[in-house]
């Protein structure tokens, strides 16, 4: 058993049918010695008396808010949560496996640049009685500071019969140098509590591996005289690291017809312009990627040909 | 990524082309190592990230873009001195810091070159003959060093009398390649920045 926060405790259970469970001793936080009784949740049934209460925790029915009283007055509370270990593996019931980029990916994180700021998100089908708390650091043995905000519900989607809820959090490394070569990964730890179930999820990554630039901005077309060709130009996104000559991007320019089946013409360039043939009803899209370290491509920025 | 390779303009900063080739070569070698050594811990998540140049060179600090010198987090240690002549500085009025930067890059390359050559000698003795260093990568390191043209003491190739542990050697190869790729990215960024300056 360990303390998650004041008066909230997590009991770790080897989870299998007929398991013996864990013996837990609760102590009433009071100088009083006599006339103390214990109850669980809203029930008025007295579970025991005395300054300590010994219970055998086996299932969720044994978890909850234990309260010690004296003469109708509440003295203190202890909330017991359960953390299930199923055959050596901690349970992952609360969050959905996003399966990208690999199985057992519960947390996904992205950074728009090398400033040390990043966003993580996760999915669940649970709508109520759900709380998250996020901590992060650079490295684990001698951790350096990363500050995370509160997790917030960022999107709701309908998936078949189920509703899916997306939560996200923003974090910032306290003293980040954009040019630094990372040797210790960022660690992100999410504590999830649903009713009386506790779970924790972790992700470990280098900022360089989660970079996904914003799409190029100010995408413009300039027709070339007496030609079907156009000059496409764009700019680096505002959120990208500076100076751009050091943090350079490479670009992919695509001409796509109205029909998805039509052949796509693609050009790769390090410049912020390109000359392409603009077909009728086609659209021109441009996306960006770090020129030197191949992490994710940005989303496409698009303009119609007409 | 198979992108069309741009050929440098004649007036271009001479080392940019070589640094681009270096990054391409080390990335290809790392990809090959990860595929060939699939049953070894060779991915970024599995290896220990070691920097053989740590406390010996200070490329990131010495080559910091001017715009980032205001960022206190980038100014941890900038107290290294290196030789200040080199042909990449050709016909340019360069600051002491720029010379320091290129000299630091040269020292990095020299250290990695020695490590890779020593490692290749061990890998050639492996009866499995599973993996060797790409000669193209070694040649590209050499070309960039020549372009930088710093006079520096030659570091003797390490020779080891004991029987090599091939498993450990292959894991060390993965560690070296990951670290060298990261340094090659920094070198490329620096050359691009200097070229634009």
């Amino acid at each position: 058993i360990w303390e998650l926060k004041k008066d909230v405790y997590v009991v770790e259970l080897d989870w299998y049918p007929d398991a013996p469970g864990e013996m837990v001793v609760l102590t009433c936080d009071t100088p009083e010695e006599d006339g103390i009784t214990w109850t669980l949740d809203q029930s008025s049934e007295v579970l025991g008396s005395g300054k300590t209460l010994t219970i055998q925790v086996k299932e969720f029915g044994d978890a909850g808010q234990y309260t010690c009283h004296k003469g109708g007055e509440v003295l203190s509370h202890s909330l017991l949560l359960l953390h299930k270990k199923e055959d050596g593996i901690w349970s992952t019931d609360i969050l959905k496996d996003q399966k990208e980029p690999k199985n057992k990916t519960f947390l996904r994180c992205e950074a728009k640049n090398y400033s040390g700021r990043f966003t993580c998100w996760w999915l669940t089908t649970i709508s109520t009685d759900l709380t998250f708390s996020v901590k992060s650091s650079r490295g684990s043995s001698d951790p350096q500071g990363v500050t995370c905000g509160a997790a917030t519900l960022s999107a709701e989607r309908v998936r078949g019969d189920n509703k899916e809820y997306e939560y996200s959090v923003e974090c910032q490394e306290d003293s980040a140098c954009p040019a630094a070569e990372e040797s210790l990964p960022i660690e992100v730890m999410v504590d999830a509590v649903h009713k009386l179930k506790y779970e924790n999820y972790t992700s470990s990554f280098f900022i360089r591996d989660i970079i996904k630039p914003d799409p190029p901005k100010n995408l413009q077309l300039k027709p070339l005289k007496n030609s079907r060709q156009v000059e496409v130009s764009w700019e680096y996104p505002d959120t990208w690291s500076t100076p751009h000559s050091y943090f350079s991007l490479t670009f992919c320019v695509q001409v796509q017809g109205k029909s998805k089946r039509e052949k796509k013409d693609r050009v790769f360039t390090d410049k912020t312009s390109a000359t392409v043939i603009c077909r009728k009803n086609a659209s021109i899209s441009v996306r960006a990627q770090d020129r030197y370290y191949s992490s994710s491509w940005s989303e496409w920025a698009s303009v119609p040909c007409s | 990524r198979n992108l069309p390779v741009a050929t440098p303009d004649p007036g271009m900063f001479p080392c940019l082309h070589h640094s681009q080739n270096l990054l391409r070569a080390v990335s290809n070698m790392l990809q090959k190592a990860r595929q060939t050594l699939e049953f070894y811990p060779c991915t970024s998540e599995e290896i220990d990230h070691e920097d053989i140049t740590k406390d010996k060179t200070s490329t990131v600090e010495a080559c910091l873009p001017l715009e980032l010198t205001k960022n206190e987090s980038c100014l941890n240690s900038r107290e290294t001195s290196f030789i200040t002549n080199g042909s990449c500085l050709a016909s340019r009025k360069t600051s002491f810091m720029m010379a320091l930067c290129l000299s630091s890059i040269y020292e990095d390359l020299k250290m990695y070159q020695v490590e890779f050559k020593t490692m290749n000698a061990k890998l050639l003795m492996d009866p499995k003959r599973q993996i060797f260093l790409d000669q193209n990568m070694l040649a590209v390191i050499d070309e960039l060093m020549q372009a930088l043209n710093f006079n520096s003491e030659t570091v003797p190739q390490k020779s080891s009398l004991e029987e090599p542990d091939f498993y450990k050697t292959k894991i060390k190869l993965c560690i070296l390649l990951h670290a060298f790729r990261i340094r090659a990215v920094t070198i490329d960024r620096v050359m691009s920045y200097l070229n634009a300056s």
């Epitope: 299998y16 049918p17 270990k85 055959d87 050596g88 593996i89 | -």
Partner: antibody, heavy 115, light 112 residues
């Protein structure tokens, strides 16, 4: 104590279907994941499928994917394995088992696929 | 479909020490715990070892399990006639609680 009683085995022709049941008692069935494991005559144990405690996730061995469906009815304390397009190589003793460090096994039920 | 490799058979005389190896890889044994089962003819498998080296109550202490790197092993110190059975190791693939992977099985014969 924990008991798993299996039923539904038998002889079936290739291409036909069969549904196995596993009735659980002696524990809170709705709190635990369940597996099906099989053993062909004279061969080793082969994992077939797994279902989470609430039925939200199901996982299958490649050899049965698309043909077998694992399901559960927590109100009836019963686990099922629906087997379609049966093949001769599906001939085996099928066991249901609880998920956890200490697992409990059913008595097994024989499925014979033969023409 | 067997990801874990065991020797087909091992034998020993009563009182001898018998060991069975179980060889896997980074995706299973390295990253997950190992179990061992004993199966007597015509019966369901019985759990002998869980969590690499833990014995459920009721299992004699002559059975012990260990794990190192990509392999695990089961030792029977002072093998007895009633230990003649098939033995299987089991782990999970890639921390994925769903997919159990079993060993190929080892027949233990007690001579004499």
């Amino acid at each position: 104590q924990v008991q798993l009683v299996q039923s539904g085995g038998g002889v079936v022709q290739p291409g036909r279907s069969l549904r196995l049941s596993c009735a659980a008692s002696g524990f809170t069935f709705s709190s635990y994941g369940m597996h099906w494991v099989r053993q062909a005559p004279g061969k080793g144990l082969e994992w077939v499928a797994f279902i989470r405690y609430d039925g939200s996730n199901k996982y299958y061995a490649d050899s049965v994917k698309g043909r077998f469906t694992i399901s559960r009815d927590n109100s009836k304390n019963t686990l099922y394995l629906q087997m379609k397009s049966l093949r001769a190589e599906d001939t085996a003793v099928y066991y249901c088992t609880t998920h956890g460090s200490h697992d409990n096994w059913g008595q097994g039920t024989m499925v014979t696929v033969s023409s | 479909s067997y990801v874990l490799t065991q020797p087909p058979s091992v034998s020993g005389t009563p009182g001898q020490r018998v060991t069975i190896s179980c060889s896997g890889g980074r995706s299973n044994i390295v990253s997950n715990t190992v179990k061992w089962y004993q199966q007597l003819p015509g019966t369901a498998p019985k759990l002998l070892i869980y969590g690499n080296d833990q014995r459920p109550s009721g299992v004699p202490d002559r059975f012990s399990g260990s794990k190192s790197g990509t392999s695990a092993s089961l030792a029977i110190t002072g093998v007895q006639a009633e230990d003649e059975a098939d033995y299987y190791c089991q782990s999970y693939d890639r921390g994925f609680t769903g997919s159990r992977v079993f060993g190929t099985g080892t027949k233990v014969t007690v001579l004499g």
